[in-house]
Each structure stands twice: as C-alpha cells, then as structure tokens.
Interface confidence: low
C-alpha cells in the first residue's frame, strides 16, 4: 500500500553477509515496514 509514516532502517545482511548488505531503505507504508524491516536493532 501507499502512504503511511516513513521508516528509515538499515536492511542488514541476513546470513553470513550474503544478502542485502547494509542497504538503507525508506519504507513507505506500514505494510512494507512489516514486510522488509528485518532487524529492529538496525533501526535508525
């Protein structure tokens, strides 16, 4: 969905730094926040 508050987070690597390494994401909806915000400790 669209709208909603924006969240900045670091989308950390998942396992052994294999994937999505240190990518800054601005997630654009609560739904995307749930879908892509993998690590609360990565929040900014």
């Amino acid at each position: 969905g669209g709208g909603g508050s924006k969240h900045k987070c670091v989308q950390n690597s998942l396992v052994n730094n294999e994937t999505l390494e240190s990518i800054m994401n601005t997630l654009e909806s609560e739904e995307d926040f749930r879908k892509y915000f993998y690590y609360l400790e990565g929040s900014k």
């Epitope: 669209g2 994401n25 654009e28 749930r34 892509y36």
Partner: antibody, heavy 114, light 113 residues
C-alpha cells in the same frame, strides 16, 4: 500503485546477447532492490539474481555468473538485466520483481533459436 | 544452496474442499534473532507472473482472500486453501529468501476434481 513494466519479446541467435528492461513506478525506486527470475517453457521459477537500486550492489546466481549483468538507472527508475552468450536453454520468460517478489513485472519472452 | 521441495507435485480437489500443499527446506529458514521464517508462497496462473500470497511463512499479503493461510516454521511449511474456488486453479510455489540464491520449490499444480 506499484507497477513494473518490462520491455517486449525478443528473438535472439545462439551466442548473442539480450538486455531486458523493467521500469518501476508507484514507489521510491531507490528504496528497494530488484530481483530477476526466469521461467523456461512449462518449467518452474529460477532466481537469477538481485540488484540494490540504492547502491547498485548485486548478487548473482552462481550458474549465471559471468554471463549476467544487472544494472539500474535511477534517473528513469529502470532496472536492466543483460544476458550474454545466449544458448537455446536460455529460452524463457524473464521476470523482474521488487526485492524478493512482492510485485512482479508482466514478463519478457526471450527466444533463443538459430 | 537451500533446496526447496514441495509435495505433492499436483492435486485435484473438489470445489469447496480443503487443499494442502507442503514445502520442505533443506535447512532452516528461521532467523533466531527476529524469530521470522524467510518463506513466501506464490500463486501463478497460466500466462501471468507469480502473485505473492504469503510472506514470513504466515502473513497474508493485502488483498489476498482469507481462505489462503500459511503455517510452519524452520524447515516444514504448509499452504492451505480452506475452501477451494474455481479461480484458485493455478500452480503454487514456495520460496525461501533467507539466503542467496533465493530458491523456489518446483511448484504444485492445483486442479478441480
């Protein structure tokens, strides 16, 4: 609404290259990555790789390493997938998808035939 | 690489009946730090791209009917269609996005009996 619109079908000779485009709209392009997935006729889904639209980082499937290149143009919110040294078994529908697959393009049929 | 194996390869179910598809990963896709399973389910109809149904193994994508549900954790997962409708005829795929290469199951074809 989120949309991924891909370029049209291609027919290529063995040994040639193909470059498929995927134009994104409805979201902030640089906030997400783009995956490329292909599907040979009557077969399942094969993940080809992923590119970050934020910083251009790529992660390619090992079997395609050296033949595939994924790029983005942030000025036009477009992702590209180029596959070189085409073989008949590269004949497939090629899909782009946002990140690991919440939104998908309509697919691009690439036929490799002599 | 993580291998994903679905069963059965195909199934025929009467309208209104339950359809169950299983997916097994060759290693766990549960990340202990956030207790999330990096597992998605897709539906693909002929001539169309896959459509996301379920992510995090059990979270339904917005707009997906509630007859679709996902369950399981670690290495064993299930997609259930509680009451099969004619429009549910399709091929269903599971996918892990725990580690690259992100891999798909071979697909399960669901038909009407």
């Amino acid at each position: 609404q989120v949309q991924l619109v891909q370029s049209g079908a291609e027919v290529k000779k063995p040994g040639a290259s193909v470059k498929v485009s995927c134009k994104a709209s409805g979201y902030t392009f640089t906030s997400y990555g783009v995956s490329w997935v292909r599907q040979a006729p009557g077969q399942g889904l094969e993940w080809m790789g992923w590119i970050s639209a934020y910083n251009g980082n790529t992660n390619y499937a090992q079997k395609l390493q050296g033949r595939v290149t994924m790029t983005t143009d942030t000025s036009t919110s477009t992702a590209y997938m180029e596959l070189t040294s085409l073989r008949s078994d590269d004949t497939a529908v090629y899909y782009c998808a946002r990140n690991w697959g919440d939104y998908w393009g309509q697919g691009t049929l690439v036929t490799v035939s002599s | 690489d993580i291998q994903m194996t679905q069963s059965p390869d195909s199934l025929a179910v009467s309208l209104g009946e339950r359809a169950t598809i299983n997916c097994k990963s060759s290693q766990s896709v549960l990340y202990s730090s956030n207790n999330k399973n990096y597992l998605a389910w897709y539906q693909q109809k002929p001539g169309q791209p896959p459509k996301l149904l379920i992510y995090w193994a059990s979270t339904r994508e917005s707009g997906v009917p509630d007859r679709f549900s996902g369950s399981g954790s670690g290495t064993d997962f299930t997609l259930t269609i509680s009451s099969l409708q004619a429009e549910d005829v399709a091929v269903y795929y599971c996918q892990q996005y725990y580690s690259t290469p992100w891999t798909f199951g071979q697909g399960t074809k669901v038909e009407i009996k």
